[in-house]
Amino acid sequence: EEELQVIQPDKSVLVAAGETATLRCTATSLIPVGPIQWFRGAGPGRELIYNQKEGHFPRVTTVSDLTKRNNMDFSIRIGNITPADAGTYYCVKFRKGSPDDVEFKSGAGTELSVRAKPSAPVVSGPAARATPQHTVSFTCESHGFSPRDITLKWFKNGNELSDFQTNVDPVGESVSYSIHSTAKVVLTREDVHSQVICEVAHVTLQGDPLRGTANLSETIRVPPTLEVTQQPVRAENQVNVTCQVRKFYPQRLQLTWLENGNVSRTETASTVTENKDGTYNWMSWLLVNVSAHRDDVKLTCQVEHDGQPAVSKSHDLKVSAHPKEQGSNTAAENTGSNERNIY
């Protein structure tokens, strides 16, 4: 009678993560008597996957009933496959021995490859906000995919970016892989409503790439522009001065009025108006009693935005040149304004 052969008909099997792998194995003879075992890998470090004779294998089921006397089908199914299951599986026939069974013949092996989807890309921006014209870095990470081939693209508002660097780790063979990419983005004043998108394409996604997004509203700081103007007279000897705070983001803003360098009032931006580009405008006013001042008055609108150093704009009220009988709208002359940083 011809000597027993162990036949593994599939040289390779490709399975998606989470599915069941069927590893086929048949023997050509019932002799010699002895169990079949399945191993992953070869040599002394091989891992026992299934033993017909003993052991408990909660993930493995046999395709046919191995207790039947004439059974020669030793195929197995392994459930809930993960990338860690990848490797070459050997069906090995043992000959009954005493005290231990002796390895008799091995199949040629079946290479199990696992296709695993990448995790949803996670995009993260810089820790601190940055102002327009500055370049900021965004990172995108996705993990757990197999095989290694993967494509990553960056977009800003639908426009593909070109300034980025991508790494896939590890470099050598692995059960699964990770991708890490860093993109550089130049901020503009209009970016409050902008989005940065990281798009990952992989064979497991069947043409439907995964996307991760970051809103530039979390990253950008648009500093305000200030304008101090004198309004028409409200009452005898009173001048209304307004400070227009325009085009700022985020909303966090505190304004202080100074009269000749002395704090007159501090307020926090509350009822702001939003511009189409997502920035905010706000206006504060100060009623100045001109008759209370003997000399010219320097009014300063000082704004601290989002924890940054204060910016200010000043406006000079001349009180000496205003006879009482004249209208208050001529009682103050705008002698120009200057912008300075207060530290």
């Epitope: 408990h56 459930g79 809930n80 005290p99």
Partner: antibody, heavy 123, light 108 residues
Framework: QLQLQESGPGLVKPSETLSLTCTVS??????????MGWIRQPPGKGLEWIGH???????YYNSALQSRVTISVDTSKNQFSLKLSSVTAADTAVYYC?????FGSGQAWFTYWGQGTLVTVSS | EIVLTQSPGTLSLSPGERATLSCSSS???????LHWYQQKPGQAPRLLIS???NLASGIPDRFSGSGSGTDYTLTISRLEPEDVAVYYC?????????FGQGTKLEIK
């Protein structure tokens, strides 16, 4: 801290169904390579394996009890349960729930045990 | 099913002595599938040794295990009063999992 706690009626009438619940904390019941089992111990006697269920819902039962036993898991509550139907006085025992871990290469054993609950079958 | 027979049924020794507990299997089993549990009075069992000789976490090294085939041994090198318990062997070689009937260890 990892804990297992059995709960259920201490007294069941003959021919009725014994129902026990094991609530676990410190780990999740759907963790890969983890299973949950029931073992019982009649008063003054040894341990008898009833059965266990793995994270992938594979179930194994003692053939002597199989026709009467159901083990199920509720992962949302981190609980698993035992139902033993048509009980007799011979089912009087301390019932233990235990975690079974799979270590690869066919090796599995009971790593953590609950304190046990005494169930008496009597009319 | 595999039947495990433990001997002796009861073992009574003095503190400091060496205790040898035996577990015999009705079928040959691989050493990786033989485990030992300790059950102290009024308590649940706890894993003592897995795979014939691997001490579970927190078990003092005066406990050791050995054996192969059908004959397995649990040894306590120097008995301590807190070792009073019933010791069970268990096989995970084949379903149904089975336990030995236990050896009761007493301290004189």
């Amino acid at each position: 801290q990892l804990q297992l706690q059995e709960s259920g009626p201490g007294l069941v009438k003959p021919s009725e169904t014994l129902s026990l619940t094991c609530t676990v904390s410190g780990f999740s019941l759907n963790t890969y390579d983890i299973g949950m089992g029931w073992i019982r111990q009649p008063p003054g006697k040894g341990l008898e394996w009833i059965g266990h269920i793995w994270w992938n819902d594979r179930e194994y039962y003692n053939s002597a009890l199989q026709s009467r036993v159901t083990i199920s898991v509720d992962t949302s509550k981190n609980q698993f349960s035992l139902k033993l139907s048509s009980v007799t006085a011979a089912d009087t025992a301390v019932y233990y729930c235990a975690r079974i871990d799979y270590f690869g290469s066919g090796q599995a054993w009971f790593t953590y045990w609950g304190q046990g609950t005494l169930v008496t079958v009597s009319s | 099913e595999i039947v495990l027979t433990q001997s002796p049924g009861t073992l009574s020794l003095s503190p400091g002595e060496r205790a040898t507990l035996s577990c015999s299997s009705s079928s040959t089993i691989s050493s990786t599938y033989l485990h030992w549990y300790q059950q102290k009075p009024g308590q649940a069992p706890r894993l003592l040794i897995s795979g014939t000789s691997n001490l579970a976490s927190g078990i003092p090294d005066r406990f050791s295990g050995s054996g192969s085939g059908t004959d397995y041994t649990l040894t306590i090198s120097r008995l301590e009063p807190e070792d009073v318990a019933v010791y069970y062997c268990q096989q995970g070689s084949r379903i149904p999992f089975t336990f030995g009937q236990g050896t009761k260890l007493e301290i004189k």
